[in-house]
C-alpha cells in the first residue's frame, strides 16, 4: 500500500519522510494467546485520534479487539491475526510504531511452529560449511523493546550435514533455567522466543550454528525499554454524558487501562447543605458502586441505573485507583419528563427542516 | 450510494433540549469516523464534535463541551446529537459528515443536507 | 474569529486562474493536513481537496491544492461560472484537539 509521503510531527516541526518509521518489532503469540500492542505517543505531546492498521485496512473495536489510549489487544488470537500492524495517527496517517505479529499454531512445543519459513529449502547436496540462508533477515542487530513484549531472535541457516544451533548470552551458554518465564528454542525455526521481557533480559545474544566442517555466529543487541509506571488511564470520552426520559434505564460506561492491579468506584456528586464542596474544596460524592466479593472488574466498568428520577439527575464519577495513584472522568445525566410531556411541546412550536 | 440524512432539528427555547439523528446508508457505518458540522445563518462552517471509530475517541469544540454529547449506534446505522441547555448562539444548520477510509487522511467526504436548529423564546 | 485566516472575497473572470489563501499556525496548518470545501449557494459543502493537494475522484484537475509552511492554497484554473460559491479551508488543531475551519472566501466570477 503506497502512502506517499506524510508528514511527521517531531518536536512540533513537519517534515517529510518514509511510510514506515525505521523501527519494526516483530512478535511471535500462540494461538488462543491476547496479541498486545503498545505504542506509546513520541513526546507524549497530543497526537489527536488514532487508528491501528492491519496489512494496510484500518481496525474497529469489536468484543474481539480492544483498542485504548496507546494500545491494542486481540483476543483468542489465530493465524489470521499474523500481519502487519502500525498504529497511526487518524488524520495524516502518520506511522506511530509498526509490527509485525506472527501468530502459530503450537506456542509451547519446540519444532512444530509453521508458517512461511516452513517451506525454507534447507535440503544442500554437496557436503560443506553452515551458510546463512536469510542474512536480509538479520540485518537488525540491536532490538529495543517495551518490558512485558515478546522477543524472537532467528538465525535461519542451512549446510550439510544440517547444522545445530546454540545460544550464548553475554558469551556463555544460555538455557531456559537461566531467566524466569524460560526460553521457547524452535530449531526448524532457528529461532530463539523469549516471552515477557525483563530488564535482567538485556545483553548480548548469539546464535552458534555448527556442523563438522565449520561454524558461524551472529550477535544481537537486547535492551529492555522499561515500563514507566503509571496511574490507570481511563479511555477518553467515558463516561458519556447521557440524556435520559423520566423511568427509563440508563448506563454509564467506563474504560480502564492499567499495569497494576485497579480498584474501580462509581461516585455521585452530592450536595450538603446546599454546597457541592467541602470546607477544603473536596467534593461531597456518595459511593454508587466499589469492588466487592464477587464484582469483576468488567462488572465495575458499567454503572447501570433503573428506572431513573428527577433525582438521578446530576454529575457521576468513574474513579479508578492503582498503586502509582488515580484517575477519574465525570459525566452528567440530565433526566427529561415522560414522553407525552414532550410531544406537546413539539407540536406547540417546532420547525423542522431537513 | 453514500447517503447521510439529519432529522431533529426544529424551534426549542433558550435552555432547551434537542437530539438529532443522523441515518446514513451505503457504507459500512461502523468501519467510519463521523462528525457534526454546523453553519449560523450567514455565517461560516464550525466543526462540532466528531467521534473515532479508530480509538473510540470523541472529541467536542470548546463552545459545545459540557452541553453537547455525540454518540453512534452502529446497528441502526445512525449518528446522534444530544444538545442540552441551548443557546440563542446555537441556532445553526447542523451537518453530519463522513470521513473518509481509517487508512487514508482525514477528510470529510460526505455530507448531509443539513436540519435547522432554531433556539429563541 | 476563525481559527484559519481566509480573504472573505475573491473574483474572477472566466477562464482566469483565481487563488484562494488560508493562513494558519504550527498547531494546526504546520503539523497537519489541510482540505478544501466548495458550497454553493443552498446546498451541503462538498470536498474538494484533501491532504493538501490531493483530489477526490470526480473533481476536475482545474481545482489544485498546496502547502509551505502555515499557510495553504487553493487555485482554480479555467475559471467557470459555476465555481461561484463558498471555498472553506479546514485542518485538525493539536491545541484545540479539533477540527477547525477558514471562515471563507465568496467566491465571484465577474
Known amino acids: 500500500e503506497s502512502l506517499g509521503t506524510e508528514q511527521r510531527v517531531v518536536g512540533r516541526v513537519a517534515e517529510v519522510s518514509g511510510p514506515e518509521p525505521s523501527q519494526q518489532e516483530q512478535l511471535v503469540f500462540g494461538s488462543g494467546d491476547a496479541v498486545e500492542l503498545s505504542c506509546p505517543p513520541p513526546g507524549g505531546g497530543p497526537m489527536g485520534p488514532t487508528v491501528w492498521v492491519k496489512d494496510g485496512a484500518g481496525l474497529v473495536p469489536s468484543e474481539r479487539v480492544l483498542v485504548g489510549p496507546q494500545r491494542l489487544q486481540v483476543l483468542n488470537a489465530s493465524h489470521e491475526d499474523s500481519g502487519a500492524y502500525s498504529c497511526r495517527q487518524r488524520l495524516t496517517q502518520l506511522v506511530l510504531c509498526h509490527f509485525s505479529v506472527r501468530v502459530t499454531d503450537a506456542p509451547s512445543s519446540g519444532d512444530d511452529e509453521d508458517g512461511e519459513d516452513e517451506a525454507e529449502d534447507t535440503g544442500v547436496d554437496t557436503a560443506g560449511a553452515p551458510y546463512w540462508t536469510r542474512p536480509e533477515r538479520m540485518d537488525k542487530k540491536l532490538l529495543a523493546v517495551p518490558a512485558a513484549n515478546t522477543v524472537r531472535f532467528r538465525c535461519p541457516a542451512a549446510g550439510n550435514p544440517t547444522p545445530s544451533i546454540s545460544w550464548l548470552k553475554n558469551g556463555k551458554e544460555f538455557r531456559g533455567e537461566h531467566r524466569i518465564g524460560g526460553i521457547k528454542l524452535r530449531h526448524q525455526q532457528w529461532s530463539l522466543v523469549m516471552e515477557s521481557v525483563v530488564p535482567s533480559d538485556r545483553g548480548n545474544y548469539t546464535c552458534v550454528v555448527e556442523n563438522k566442517f565449520g561454524s558461524i555466529r551472529q550477535t544481537y543487541t537486547l535492551d529492555v525499554l522499561e515500563r514507566s509506571p503509571h496511574r490507570p488511564i481511563l479511555q477518553a470520552g467515558l463516561p458519556a454524558n447521557q440524556t435520559a426520559v423520566l423511568g427509563s434505564d440508563v448506563e454509564f460506561h467506563c474504560k480502564v487501562y492499567s499495569d497494576a492491579q485497579p480498584h474501580i468506584q462509581w461516585l455521585k456528586h452530592v450536595e450538603v447543605n446546599g454546597s457541592k464542596v467541602g470546607p477544603d474544596g473536596t467534593p461531597y460524592v456518595t459511593v454508587l458502586k466499589t469492588a466487592g466479593a464477587n464484582t469483576t472488574d468488567k462488572e465495575l466498568e458499567v454503572l447501570s441505573l433503573h428506572n431513573v428520577t428527577f433525582e438521578d439527575a446530576g454529575e457521576y464519577t468513574c474513579l479508578a485507583g492503582n498503586s502509582i495513584g488515580f484517575s477519574h472522568h465525570s459525566a452528567w445525566l440530565v433526566v427529561l419528563p415522560a414522553e407525552e410531556e414532550l410531544v406537546e411541546a413539539d407540536e406547540a412550536g417546532s420547525v423542522y427542516a431537513g | 450510494e453514500v447517503q447521510l440524512l439529519e432529522s431533529g432539528g426544529g424551534l426549542v427555547q433558550p435552555g432547551g433540549s434537542l437530539r438529532l439523528s443522523c441515518a446514513a446508508s451505503?457504507?459500512?457505518?461502523?468501519?467510519?469516523?463521523m462528525s457534526w458540522v454546523r453553519q449560523a445563518p450567514g455565517k461560516g462552517l464550525e466543526w462540532v464534535s466528531g467521534i473515532y471509530s479508530g480509538d473510540g475517541s470523541i472529541y467536542y469544540a470548546d463552545s459545545v463541551k459540557g452541553r453537547f454529547t455525540i454518540s453512534r449506534d452502529n446497528s441502526k446505522n445512525t449518528l446522534y446529537l444530544q444538545m442540552n441547555s441551548l443557546r440563542a448562539e446555537d441556532t445553526a444548520v447542523y451537518y453530519c459528515?463522513?470521513?473518509?477510509?481509517?487508512?487514508?487522511?482525514?477528510?470529510?467526504?460526505?455530507w448531509g443536507q443539513g436540519t435547522l436548529v432554531t433556539v429563541s423564546s | 474569529q476563525s481559527v484559519l485566516t481566509q480573504p472573505p472575497s475573491a473574483s474572477g473572470t472566466p477562464g482566469q486562474r483565481v487563488t484562494i489563501s488560508c493562513s494558519g499556525s504550527?498547531?494546526?496548518?504546520?503539523?497537519?493536513?489541510v482540505s478544501w470545501y466548495q458550497q454553493l449557494p443552498g446546498t451541503a459543502p462538498k470536498l474538494l481537496i484533501y491532504?493538501?493537494?490531493k483530489r477526490p475522484s470526480g473533481v476536475p484537475d482545474r481545482f489544485s491544492g498546496s502547502k509551505s509552511g502555515t499557510s495553504a492554497s487553493l487555485a482554480i484554473s479555467g475559471l467557470r461560472s459555476e465555481d461561484e460559491a463558498d471555498y472553506y479551508c479546514?485542518?485538525?488543531?493539536?491545541?484545540?484537539?479539533?477540527?477547525?475551519f477558514g471562515g471563507g472566501t465568496k467566491l465571484t466570477v465577474l
Open positions: 504550527s498547531s494546526n496548518i504546520g503539523n497537519n493536513y
Open positions: 491532504a493538501d493537494s
Open positions: 479546514a485542518s485538525w488543531d493539536y491545541s484545540l484537539s479539533g477540527y477547525v
Open positions: 451505503g457504507f459500512t457505518f461502523s468501519s467510519y469516523d
Open positions: 459528515a463522513k470521513d473518509g477510509p481509517m487508512n487514508e487522511e482525514s477528510r470529510f467526504d460526505y
